[in-house]
């Protein structure tokens, strides 16, 4: 067990803060909840603290919760491939470019680390080149989320990882908006981290609303499990 993994044996409070600027529309979001890495479970509620969110909530899911991949459940035989927990408590920097097909792009930079007993994800997001009447600024996405696989590989030169995946956002007219994600994570501290073999995270996300909440918000329940690496031969003969 890595030193960082020991911090995730129970339920951990999570705080998410985001500053966004998309085509000049500035906004801030605050999220609170908890994660339980034993089950790969995240429960979070996000509130737009600047009024109405100028982009659809589903476009921010990867930035919020796929940002705290340290809560992914890594099965026993894969724990040596869990970069995310091994970087804690100092944490990691997570940078992404998200290309929305036939529309604009988000660039994000986040610092994910422990502050006391709380896992904090602080994010800055810049969005450019979006069409004012497109699927994103035109709010044409359905309020739901598909399951995805998130592919991870080591980046030895940067002592971190590279991550690629494609998100499928459902559009109200029945079509799909694709969002290509290119991600890299580097540790903040200079301690040893686990550099993984190639594998993937299987994610399932459910979006809902709080019926008692007047503010623009999103409630998120997510389960994430690592997969893609089989038991070694020594495991088979145990």
């Amino acid at each position: 067990m890595s030193k960082g993994e020991e911090l995730f044996t129970g339920v951990v409070p999570i705080l998410v803060e985001l500053d966004g600027d998309v085509n000049g529309h500035k906004f801030s979001v605050s999220g609170e909840g908890e994660g339980d890495a034993t089950y790969g479970k995240l429960t979070l509620k996000f509130i737009c603290t600047t009024g109405k969110l100028p982009v659809p909530w589903p476009t921010l899911v990867t930035t919020f919760s796929y940002g705290v991949q340290c809560f992914s459940r890594y099965p026993d035989h894969m724990k040596q491939h869990d970069f995310f927990k091994s970087a804690m408590p100092e944490g990691y920097v997570q940078e992404r470019t998200i290309f929305f097909k036939d529309d604009g792009n988000y660039k994000t930079r986040a610092e994910v680390k422990f502050e006391g007993d709380t896992l904090v994800n602080r994010i800055e997001l810049k969005g450019i080149d979006f069409k004012e009447d497109g699927n994103i600024l035109g709010h044409k996405l359905e309020y739901n989320y598909n399951s995805h696989n998130v592919y991870i590989m080591a980046d030895k030169q940067k002592n971190g990882i590279k991550v690629n995946f494609k998100i499928r956002h459902n559009i109200e007219d029945g079509s799909v908006q694709l969002a290509d994600h290119y991600q890299q994570n580097t540790p903040i501290g200079d301690g040893p981290v686990l550099l993984p073999d190639n594998h993937y995270l299987s994610t399932q996300s459910a979006l809902s609303k709080d019926p008692n909440e007047k503010r623009d918000h999103m409630v998120l329940l997510e389960f994430v499990t690592a997969a893609g690496i089989t038991h070694g031969m020594d495991e088979l003969y145990k």
Partner: antibody, heavy 117, light 108 residues
């Protein structure tokens, strides 16, 4: 306990500049948005400016846009308001305030800014 | 942008119920917050989220909000409740906080 202490107010001539500071204590400053609200003598409360917890997003009332700049130093637990091109109508008590999600939950005691020749 | 309108003054006898209104278009769809300000002092939050009371605020303070009007109610008003009261709400990302003009509560 949670405390906000403003400083930097005083008498300044029209067209002059002033920098207000707000020292925060008793809470994790970096986790809260912060705002400035002012109150002209005998008048009501007027929101002036706000800054997000991270600090990269700032917001201004139309009456001060282009003249005032809000900033913060999370390492020093301090909020600032740089006021340039001051006018007589900027005369007010300026309050530093903590922003919890979508409302102010804690106020400082205020510092008086007087713009007069 | 939303505009919040309050009566300039309200008078009440000690022990009676004071009601201060705050009106704005579709205000019931937003949360309203109430602040008390005594002379020479900073404002103090007395109601948040329409009807929630912060710790330390007496139970005689309550709030409601529906339609176009929010109301701050002070039951069994005491002399120490004499103050200015401001309603507030949040607006778009253009103006984050909007205050009502304030109501001076006089306890006769």
């Amino acid at each position: 306990q949670v405390q906000l202490v403003e400083s930097g107010g005083g008498l300044v001539q029209p067209g002059g500049s002033l920098r207000l500071s707000c020292a925060a204590s008793g809470f994790t400053f970096s986790r809260y948005g912060m705002h400035w609200v002012r109150q002209a003598p005998g008048k009501g409360l007027e929101w002036v400016s706000g800054i997000s917890s991270i600090g990269s997003n700032t917001y201004y009332a139309d009456s001060v846009k282009g003249r005032f700049t809000i900033s913060r130093d999370n390492s020093k637990n301090t909020l600032y308001l740089q006021m340039n091109s001051l006018r007589a109508e900027d005369t007010a008590v300026y309050y530093c305030a903590r922003w919890y999600k979508t409302y102010i939950d804690v106020w400082g005691q205020g510092t008086l800014v007087t713009v007069s020749s | 942008d939303i505009e919040l309108t309050q009566p300039p003054s309200v008078s009440v006898a000690p022990g009676q119920t004071a009601r201060i209104s705050c009106s704005g278009d579709n205000l019931g769809k937003k949360y309203v917050y109430w602040y008390q300000q005594k002379p020479g002092q900073a404002p103090v939050l007395v109601i948040y989220g329409d009807d929630e009371r912060p710790s330390g605020i007496p139970e005689r303070f309550s709030g409601s909000n529906s339609g176009n009007t929010a109301t701050l109610t002070i039951s069994g008003t005491q002399a120490e409740d004499e103050a200015d009261y401001y309603c507030a709400s949040y607006d778009s990302s253009h103006i984050l906080i909007v205050f009502g003009g304030g109501t001076k509560l006089t306890v006769l």
